[in-house]
């Protein structure tokens, strides 16, 4: 085994290096000392380190680790942050377009419904946006509310235009009749299925991306234990105490130390891999009724078809509703 | 089917070509993200190696530091000795992950469970009871726009997907994004605390 080079007789080199870490030289001994108070860089002979220096080295070592982790994750972190923002904005744009398409459909096909229809459509798509962002809203309730609100307007404006406008009583009756008589056929149910499936997938996709950011942020700002700090100090800095400024840690030794320091972090690996593969599976399935872009941008067409369905059955419906809501109508005419 | 407002739709055939050839849709953007994420699948298992390769480690030198003394790079002492008679490395590993790491692992387990549930083939079938009402089924031929759910569901024709991604500012500055602390980028030879 090669003998270690003689320690720096004056600790001059150690002092000039340590000054970069900690301006002010009072902690560095002038000449090598026994170092009996040292706890990490345990000396085999005289040493150029003091207890205070050791503490500073430990702090620096842990800081190095944090910086290295941040540099490792920089590209990945940007990738997820950027995409989470892009997709969130993209989904909002889809919702905005879907609302515009639906409003345009009403304006062009049913101008008499527009003022109220615009209001109901607006509320529906606001709820859609909130749901995607994680709000606790029930999709079926959203769809029911849209059709419950639309039917009284359709009935009073398209099917039975002779009725007075502000028939609050009849409105309540019409809302109830809408569900009981399946006025819109199976269209509401169809929309519920498609909207709930596509929005659920979209919402989980966004949640997953946001969790990705959280995972990277957590490892980015990990605080390493005292034990780890001691191991790092011993590896990176204890050689300086012997005046061995140009010597580097052995590769195998570094790997052993890192396995110890990073044991907890490496435990994330299994779940991280699963996260990426599960996200891939989800994305592969995001088409047709699982693709909110497809579903929401086609919604105006389904709503249009549902109104046509009502119009086709207008005769039958008017008679039935006439009987069913007669009481409300009489009260109103009085 | 519904009237398409002129200001919202370009000629369908033109749009179809654009869609197939150039259009960057949400779906292609999602696939691209997954492919990028797959690059980082070994991120956590490779971290220890990254730290060692980005901090000063003896590569070409004959002698290296093992935590206690100077040794020859390929001797058995190169990895072992620095650990002896000091605190127990095994003990450090046994302590288990930090609470924050355990917490993030739990969150990952939860989202993975959700993602798997959503991806289950069972959930992929369009509810059959949707054709009970016997709606008129329309043409969904090759020339048509994609029909969701096949016949019997009110034949929803979906117009080709938006080119709305053009509206997106792709130059999203990471400084403005959530959860980003603007740290100075440490380059391996510029970490001031390492002496080269």
């Amino acid at each position: 085994q090669p003998p270690p080079p003689p320690p720096d007789a004056t600790c001059h080199q150690v002092r000039s290096f340590f000054q970069r870490l900690q301006p002010g030289l009072k902690w560095v001994p002038e000449t090598p000392v026994p170092g009996s108070d040292l706890q990490v860089c345990l000396p085999k002979g005289p040493t150029c380190c003091s207890r205070k220096m050791e503490e500073k080295y430990q702090l620096t070592a842990r800081l190095n680790m944090e910086q290295l982790l941040q540099s490792a994750s920089m590209e990945l972190k940007f990738l997820i942050i950027q995409n989470a923002a892009v997709f969130q904005e993209a989904f909002e744009i889809v919702v905005r377009h879907a609302k515009n398409y639906t409003n345009a459909m009403f304006k062009n096909n049913y101008p008499s419904l527009t003022p109220q229809a615009f209001e109901f459509v607006g509320e529906f798509f606001t709820d859609v946006s909130l749901y995607i962002l994680g709000s606790d809203i029930n999709v079926d309730d959203m769809v029911n509310e849209l059709f419950d609100s639309l039917f009284p307007v359709i009935y009073t404006q398209l099917m039975n235009p002779g009725l007075p406008d502000s028939a609050l009583d009849i409105n309540e009756c019409l809302r109830g009749a809408r569900r009981d008589l399946k006025v819109f056929g199976n269209f509401p149910k169809l929309i519920m299925t498609q909207v709930s499936k596509s929005l659920q997938v979209t919402r989980i996709f966004l949640q997953a991306l946001n969790l990705g950011i959280e995972v990277i942020n957590t490892t980015d700002h990990l605080k390493f234990s005292k034990d780890c700090g001691r191991m790092l100090t011993r590896m990176w800095y204890c050689s300086y105490c012997q005046g061995l400024m140009m010597v580097k840690p052995c590769g195998g030794y570094c790997n052993v130390v890192m396995q110890g320091c990073m044991a907890g972090v490496v435990e994330i690996d299994k779940y991280w891999r699963e996260y990426i593969l599960s996200l891939e599976e989800l994305v592969n399935g995001m088409y047709r009724i699982y693709d909110m872009e497809n579903v929401l941008l086609g919604l105006f067409s389904t709503i249009h078809d549902s109104i046509q369905y009502v119009q086709k059955n207008a005769g039958k419906l008017t008679t039935t509703i006439g009987k069913l809501c007669a009481h409300s109508q009489q009260r109103q005419y009085r | 089917s519904a009237y398409y407002p002129e200001d919202l739709f370009i000629d369908k055939k033109v749009l179809k070509v654009a869609h197939v050839e150039h259009e960057e849709t949400l779906s292609s953007r999602r696939r691209e993200l997954i492919q990028k994420l797959k690059s980082f699948i070994s991120f956590y298992s490779a971290l220890p190696g990254y730290i060692c390769s980005h901090s000063p480690v003896a590569e070409n030198d004959t002698l290296c530091w093992n935590g206690q003394e100077l040794v020859e790079r390929y001797s058995q002492k190169a990895a072992r000795n620095g650990m002896k008679n000091q605190f127990n490395l095994h003990e450090l590993k046994m302590k288990g992950p930090e609470p924050v790491v355990s917490q993030i692992i739990d969150k990952l387990k939860h989202i993975n469970q959700l993602l798997r549930t959503m991806s289950m083939p069972k959930g992929r079938v369009l509810d059959k009871n949707l054709d009970e009402e016997g709606f008129e089924s329309g043409d969904c031929g090759d020339d048509e726009d994609e029909c969701i759910g096949g016949s019997g569901d009110g034949m929803i024709k979906v117009k080709n997907q938006l080119r709305f991604l053009a509206e997106l500012a792709y130059d999203l500055d990471v400084d403005d994004a959530p959860g980003n602390s603007q740290q100075a980028t440490p380059k391996d030879n510029e970490i001031s605390t390492f002496h080269n």
């Epitope: 590209e75 990945l76 | 797959k38 690059s39 070994s42 490779a46 990254y50 792709y170 130059d171």
Partner: antibody, heavy 119, light 106 residues
């Protein structure tokens, strides 16, 4: 450490096909994209395509669709690129290159395989 | 497809001097640019990724900067072993190399 060892030089006739190999070692082969890059004599680098050994997912540069086919053999950690209907335009040095773990850039490269197409 | 325009295509500089190479992308590439050194008969060597992050073992004489569509790469204190061809690579949307810059020492 990461190493990519490519097969030796090839001299083939126009119209024929050739299969170049790239044996990987020193890392988890299945978890990194393997890319292929072309360099014609005196010219720059041109990306051909990539394959993800874990699931066989591929992307190609449009100019090489139908020309190059990428495959892998996970059991031997080897990536292959088959080039078909060869012409003199295909004479070049072909590199395999690994997609990084901490970056999506190509971080380790093979030494290159020289392909000469001549009758 | 994203195009990368690299300039100059060749340059000559003195030992100890500084050189700068630029790459312009046809669209914003979100800092996803890498720089390579390529010597004849070898595979290219990654020097810098993500605009400015140095690979391990690469001296700090090499540096990179930029954002959006415009990026630059510099070598200061030129040494004889820096003679090579240098390439930029965008990896925001698959991969596109710049045309290359051949560096010679005066």
């Amino acid at each position: 450490q990461v190493q990519l060892q490519q097969s030796g030089p090839e001299l083939v006739k126009p119209g024929a096909s050739v299969k170049i190999s790239c044996k990987a070692s020193g890392y988890a082969f299945s978890s990194s994209w393997m890319n292929w890059v072309k360099q014609r004599p005196g010219k720059g680098l041109e990306w051909i395509g990539r394959i993800y050994p874990g699931d066989g997912d591929t992307n190609y540069n449009g100019r090489f669709k139908g020309k190059a086919t990428l495959t892998v053999d996970k059991s031997s950690s080897t990536a292959y690129m088959q080039l078909s209907s060869l012409t003199s335009e295909d004479s070049a040095v072909y590199f395999c290159a690994r997609g990084g773990v901490f970056t999506m850039a190509l971080d380790h490269w093979g030494q290159g395989t020289t392909l000469t197409v001549s009758s | 497809d994203i195009q990368m325009t690299q300039s100059p295509s060749s340059l000559s500089a003195s030992l100890g001097g500084k050189v700068t190479i630029t790459c312009k992308a046809s669209q914003d590439i979100n800092k996803y640019i890498a720089w390579y050194q390529h010597k004849p008969g070898k595979g290219p060597r990654l020097l810098i990724h993500y605009t400015s992050t140095l690979q391990p073992g690469i001296p700090s004489r090499f540096s990179g900067s930029g954002s959006g569509r415009d990026y630059s790469f510099s070598i200061s204190n030129l040494e004889p072993e820096d003679i090579a061809t240098y390439y930029c690579l965008q990896y925001d949307n698959l991969f596109t190399f710049g045309g290359g810059t051949k560096l010679e020492i005066k």
